[in-house]
Interface confidence: low
C-alpha cells in the first residue's frame, strides 16, 4: 500500500479570500502565475484552519468546469479539456500545452461540510515565449531578480563542471534544473513523500484515497461506476484524515 | 455473484453500542467503498458514512460523527458498523452497500434500542 | 446541505399507466452524481437508475431517468403490478456526501 501526504508550499503563498463569511477556513493559492506558451503549469489551491471534511474540489476557468475530483468517484475532467489537463499533484490540476487563450482567472471551489463552500481564485498570465525567458511578470520582483541571478551564476557552474568534468556534475545539474523552474515563474513544490500521478489527498498522513492504491489507471470503482466517455482513466483522489 | 451478508438482529439498552457485520463475496473486496445507510420504522434512508477496505479510508455523516466507526477486515471480507451511545430513535434496519451506486445491498440489520 | 424534495409524496396509479416521479435538488448538481432505489416492503433498496439515466444491470426499459442541474425525472412507461412500491432518489458529492430524497410511495389505484 502507498500511502502519500500532501505536497505543501515552499514559497508563495497567497490568502484567498473566503466565498462566503463566518467559516474559519482559509484557502492558500500561488495567487497571480505565468508560465510559458507552450509549457505546463501547476494550479494549486490548499484549505486549511478548518476541520471541516471536504467532499469535493471543482476546478473552474470563468464559468466553465475543468475538472472534478470527488472524495468517492475520483477525477472526472472535462471533455472538451481532457487532453490538456492532467490531475494533480494532490488536489491541484496541472494545465498542458498552454495557449495565450488561457490566460485569465482560475477558480478551485472546495465543497465541505458542515462549513460550505470556499473558493479560491489564481490568475494566470500565458506568455510568449521570448517574453517568458525574461522572467514573469507576476512574480514579486525580488523573488524574480534572484532567480535571474541565480540562473547566471548557476550557468556559469555549469560551464565550469562541463569542462572539469568532475563527479559533482549531476548533482548540480538537478540544482540547475530547480532554478530553471523558478525562472519561469512555476510554483516550487517540496513533496514530504512521493504523490503519483492521478492522486489526491488531502490530510496529512491520509490513506491513498477511497480508491484504493495509487494507479495510473481507474480503480475497480471508477471503471464500474462511471460508463461514461468523458471519464477518463485518472486515478484517485481522498480527502479524509480518518483512517480505520 | 456478488452478495453483502449482515449479521443478525440486535436488541440494545439506551447508553450502549451495537455492532453490525457486512461480510462482502463475489467481488474484489478492496476494490470498492462499502456504505452504510440506516432506515427508521416508516421513514426514509439516511447514509451514514463509507470506508473502502483497500487502505481503511474513512468518511462519516456529520450527523454521526463521534459516535459511528467503520471497520474493515480484509482476511474475512468484512466490514463493520459500530453506533455507541445508543438512543431510541437509533432503532433502525441498519444496511451496508456496495460502492457510490449501491449497486448491491445486504439484507438489513434491525437493531431496536429499548430499555 | 444539498436536500432533495421528491414528489408527489404519494402516486396512485393503475397497471398500464404511465408514471413520472419528480426530484429537485436545493442546489445545483452534477447528473452523473443523481441515482434512483426503488424499495419494496420489508426488502432492501434496489438501484433502478444511476447517473440520471442509465439503467441498472437487469432493470426492465420501461424505467428511464432524465434531468440536470436541480431538476430530475423518474419515468415508468407503463406500469406492471411488480412496480408499485417506494421510489428514492439520491445525490453523491455535496455534503454530506451522499443524501437521499424522502421518497415516493407508487400505490395502486
Known amino acids: 500500500m502507498r500511502w502519500c501526504l500532501l505536497l505543501i508550499w515552499a514559497q508563495g503563498l497567497r490568502q484567498a479570500p473566503l466565498a462566503s463569511g463566518m467559516m474559519t477556513g482559509t484557502i492558500e493559492t500561488t495567487g497571480n502565475i505565468s508560465a510559458e506558451k507552450g509549457g505546463s503549469i501547476i494550479l494549486q489551491c490548499h484549505l486549511s484552519s478548518t476541520t471541516a471534511q471536504v467532499t469535493q474540489v471543482n476546478w473552474e476557468q470563468q464559468d466553465q468546469l475543468l475538472a472534478i475530483c470527488n472524495a468517492d468517484l475520483g477525477w472526472h475532467i472535462s471533455p472538451s479539456f481532457k487532453d490538456r489537463v492532467a490531475p494533480g499533484p494532490g488536489l491541484g490540476l496541472t494545465l498542458q500545452s498552454l495557449t495565450v487563450n488561457d490566460t485569465g482567472e482560475y477558480f478551485c471551489i472546495y465543497h465541505t461540510y458542515p462549513d460550505g463552500t470556499y473558493t479560491g481564485r489564481i490568475f494566470l498570465e500565458v506568455l510568449e515565449s521570448s517574453v517568458a525567458e525574461h522572467g514573469a511578470r507576476f512574480q514579486i520582483p525580488l523573488l524574480g531578480a534572484m532567480a535571474a541571478t541565480l540562473v547566471v551564476i548557476c550557468t556559469a557552474v555549469i560551464v565550469v563542471v562541463a569542462l572539469t568534468r568532475k563527479k559533482k556534475a549531476l548533482r548540480i545539474h538537478s540544482v540547475e534544473g530547480d532554478l530553471r523552474r523558478k525562472s519561469a515563474g512555476q510554483e516550487e513544490w517540496s513533496p514530504s513523500a512521493p504523490s503519483p500521478p492521478g492522486s489526491c489527498v488531502q490530510a496529512e498522513a491520509a490513506p491513498a484515497g477511497l480508491c484504493g492504491e495509487q494507479r495510473g489507471e481507474d480503480c475497480a470503482e471508477l471503471h464500474d461506476y462511471f460508463n461514461v466517455l468523458s471519464y477518463r482513466s485518472l486515478g484517485n483522489c481522498s480527502f479524509f484524515t480518518e483512517t480505520g | 455473484q456478488v452478495q453483502l451478508v449482515q449479521s443478525g438482529a440486535e436488541v440494545k439498552k439506551p447508553g450502549a453500542s451495537v455492532k453490525v457485520s457486512c461480510k462482502a463475496s463475489?467481488?474484489?473486496?478492496?476494490?470498492?467503498?462499502v456504505h452504510w445507510v440506516r432506515q427508521a420504522p416508516g421513514q426514509g434512508l439516511e447514509w451514514m458514512g463509507t470506508?473502502?477496505?483497500?487502505?481503511?479510508?474513512?468518511s462519516y455523516n456529520q450527523k454521526f460523527k463521534g459516535r459511528v466507526t467503520l471497520t474493515a477486515d480484509t482476511s474475512t471480507s468484512t466490514v463493520y458498523m459500530e453506533l455507541s451511545s445508543l438512543r431510541s430513535e437509533d432503532t433502525a434496519v441498519y444496511y451496508c452497500?456496495?460502492?457510490?451506486?449501491?449497486?448491491?445491498w445486504g439484507q438489513g440489520t434491525t437493531v431496536t434500542v429499548s430499555s | 446541505e444539498i436536500v432533495l424534495t421528491q414528489s408527489p409524496g404519494t402516486l396512485s396509479l393503475s397497471p398500464g399507466e404511465r408514471a413520472t416521479l419528480s426530484c429537485r435538488a436545493s442546489s445545483s448538481i452534477s447528473s452523473t452524481y443523481l441515482h434512483w432505489y426503488q424499495q419494496k416492503p420489508g426488502a432492501s433498496p434496489k438501484l433502478l437508475i444511476y447517473?440520471?439515466?442509465n439503467l441498472a444491470s437487469g432493470i426492465p426499459d420501461r424505467f428511464s431517468g432524465s434531468g440536470s442541474g436541480t431538476s430530475y425525472t423518474l419515468t415508468i412507461s407503463r406500469l406492471e403490478p411488480e412496480d408499485f412500491a417506494v421510489y428514492y432518489c439520491?445525490?453523491?458529492?455535496?455534503?454530506?456526501?451522499?443524501?437521499f430524497g424522502a421518497g415516493t410511495k407508487l400505490e395502486l389505484k
Open positions: 447517473n440520471t439515466q
Open positions: 470506508i473502502y477496505p483497500g487502505n481503511l479510508a474513512t
Open positions: 452497500a456496495r460502492s457510490g451506486t449501491m449497486d448491491y
Open positions: 463475489g467481488y474484489t473486496f478492496t476494490s470498492y467503498n
Open positions: 439520491q445525490q453523491f458529492g455535496g455534503y454530506p456526501l451522499i443524501t
